[in-house]
């Protein structure tokens, strides 16, 4: 069954945590649907963003942070492991120094920590996708 | 009650026709939600686009056409009559020489015909909005 989109969930992250998302683009890649995952510092959608991950399917991925309301230095990748019309599984793992983004089991993107992952309080998944799975796994202490 | 998004409806347009859309952005303008309205030449989403109207709420509007699979010259406007968090009513009227786009009753954008409006067979409304009304009115002959 489908999860509502935008999908918002409270989350606490630290080294060893993994966010797993399963979904499917709502349009063909020719029409450039988007997927966006934002790790927020508060439960409010207007809060700062520790890690912003935006896919323009078929074209590019941009990653960034929003600090004190201002977007910072954008990181762009043309790597496009997503398949037109196909379901994807996205996992974002918190490593000591960066986020590692896996697409369908393949390491595809990394983003150095700018803000501590412990500052994350909420994850939002949205834009032009249908969402079938969202999970945050925590490292066993 | 809400209409599904993406929302697709068969349509035939000619001078005097008006497409009316009522909806609301799904996110605050800080997060740059999008609205897109596409007038297609076929019932297929990968078909050419006679009129492409995309709002990045709070930032800008772009208009274009997609002809034989290729995007043409983009027209951009910084005019932003949409209100953060507020419902909008959008009406696109087919004039003899152009499309006229009204936002909340105010003439906001125009786009000169590149392809005859009679070539339109389908309208799609999508991206980051909830949709409460979609109507195509035809000029009484």
């Amino acid at each position: 069954s489908l999860l509502p989109v935008p999908y918002t969930e409270a989350a606490s992250l630290s080294t060893g945590s993994t966010v797993t998302i399963k979904g499917r683009p709502l349009a063909c890649f020719l029409n450039e649907p988007y997927l966006q995952v934002d790790f927020h510092t508060e439960m409010k959608e207007e809060s700062d963003i520790v890690f912003h991950f935006q896919v323009c399917f078929g074209r590019r991925v941009v990653m960034n942070s929003r600090e004190y309301g201002a977007w910072k230095q954008q990181v762009e990748s043309k790597n496009m492991p997503f398949q037109d019309g196909q379901e994807f599984e996205l996992s974002i793992s918190v490593l000591p120094d960066k986020y590692q983004v896996m697409v369908n089991g393949q390491s595809s993107y990394t983003f150095d920590h700018r803000i501590k992952p412990e500052a994350v309080k909420m994850v939002q998944v949205w834009r032009d996708i249908s969402l079938t799975k969202f999970n945050v796994s925590y490292l066993k202490r | 009650s809400l209409l599904p998004v993406p929302y697709t409806e068969a349509a035939s347009l000619s001078t005097g026709s008006t497409v009316t859309i009522k909806g609301r952005p799904l996110a605050c303008f800080l997060n740059e939600p999008y609205l897109q309205v596409d007038f297609h030449t076929e019932m297929k989403e990968e078909s050419d686009i006679v009129f492409h109207f995309q709002v990045c709420f709070g930032r800008r509007v772009v208009m274009n056409s997609r002809e034989y699979g290729a995007w043409k010259q983009q027209v951009e406007s910084k005019n932003m009559p949409f209100q953060d968090g507020q419902e909008f009513e959008l009406s696109i009227s087919v004039l003899p020489d152009k499309y006229q786009v009204m936002v909340n009753g105010q003439s906001s954008y125009t786009f000169d015909h590149r392809i005859k409006p009679e070539a339109v067979k389908m309208v799609q409304v999508w991206r980051d909005i909830s949709l409460t009304k979609f109507n195509v009115s035809y000029l009484k002959r």
Epitope: T41, S65, E67, Q73, P96, D97 | -
Partner: antibody, heavy 119, light 107 residues
Framework: QLQLVESGGGLVQPGGSLRLSCAAS????????MYWVRQAPGKGLEWVSA????????DYAGSVKGRFTISRDNTKSTVYLQMNTLKPEDTALYYC????????????WGKGTLVTVSS | QSALTQPSAVSVSLGQTARITCQGA??????GIWYQQKPGQAPVQVIY???NRPSGIPERFSGSSSGGTATLTISGAQAEDEADYYC??????????FGGGTHLTVL
């Protein structure tokens, strides 16, 4: 091995200008943010300016904004600091630094070049 | 007035443990980094990412962070550890900020 060598310091009158250079070697310069940090005699460290890998993003401390300009030439592995309208309070040892990640901080420092602003 | 506050001086007996603190609201959000500066020399990074030691830095140097406080700990302080120590974090990810510095005296 990795080296950052600053040059261009000296004595200048208030209101004057200087251009500092920092020549980098021993690493892929175009992969790193670069920074300038200064230290007034007997005082602590003060960040001055930062520039991203391509030179498109720059940032400045409030005390130098509008007077100082940071730039870089990746073909020469060199970062510059153009200092205009100098004031006596700009007197300091100016260090060039390589930026690692935000997590890693500024991991390598040059030896510094002394700027003295005095009439 | 720096956004990061350090004690101006800390003393420690030879072989004992020295702790230097750095306080600032931004340390709850951004990482703490520590630099050692000896007279007439450029600073050298001794801790990055709150608690990581660069290669070549002795194991007696460690770092931690909790809330708005970062702490540099020197376990079994040696005479050569006498120096000024600066903490550094960020105002935003393009704007570094330094603490005022702490002079460590090894008695």
């Amino acid at each position: 091995q990795l080296q950052l060598v600053e040059s261009g310091g000296g004595l200048v009158q208030p209101g004057g200008s200087l251009r500092l250079s920092c020549a980098a070697s021993g690493f892929t310069f175009s992969n790193y943010w670069m920074y300038w940090v200064r230290q007034a005699p007997g005082k602590g460290l003060e960040w001055v300016s930062a520039i991203d890998v391509g030179g498109g993003t720059t940032d400045y401390a409030g005390s130098v904004k509008g007077r100082f300009t940071i730039s870089r030439d990746n073909t020469k592995s060199t970062v510059y600091l153009q200092m205009n309208t100098l004031k006596p309070e700009d007197t300091a040892l100016y260090y060039c630094l390589r930026g690692g990640s935000y997590y890693g901080g500024m991991d390598y420092w040059g030896k510094g070049t002394l700027v003295t602003v005095s009439s | 007035q720096s956004a990061l506050t350090q004690p101006s001086a800390v003393s420690v007996s030879l072989g004992q443990t020295a702790r230097i603190t750095c306080q600032g609201a931004k340390l709850g959000r951004y990482y703490g980094i520590w630099y050692q500066q000896k007279p007439g020399q450029a600073p050298v990074q001794v801790i990055y990412g709150d608690s990581n030691r660069p290669s070549g830095i002795p194991e007696r140097f460690s770092g931690s962070s909790s809330g708005g406080t970062a702490t540099l700990t020197i376990s079994g302080a040696q005479a050569e550890d006498e120096a000024d120590y600066y903490c550094q974090s960020y105002e935003s990810s393009t704007s570094p900020v330094f603490g005022g510095g702490t002079h460590l005296t090894v008695l």
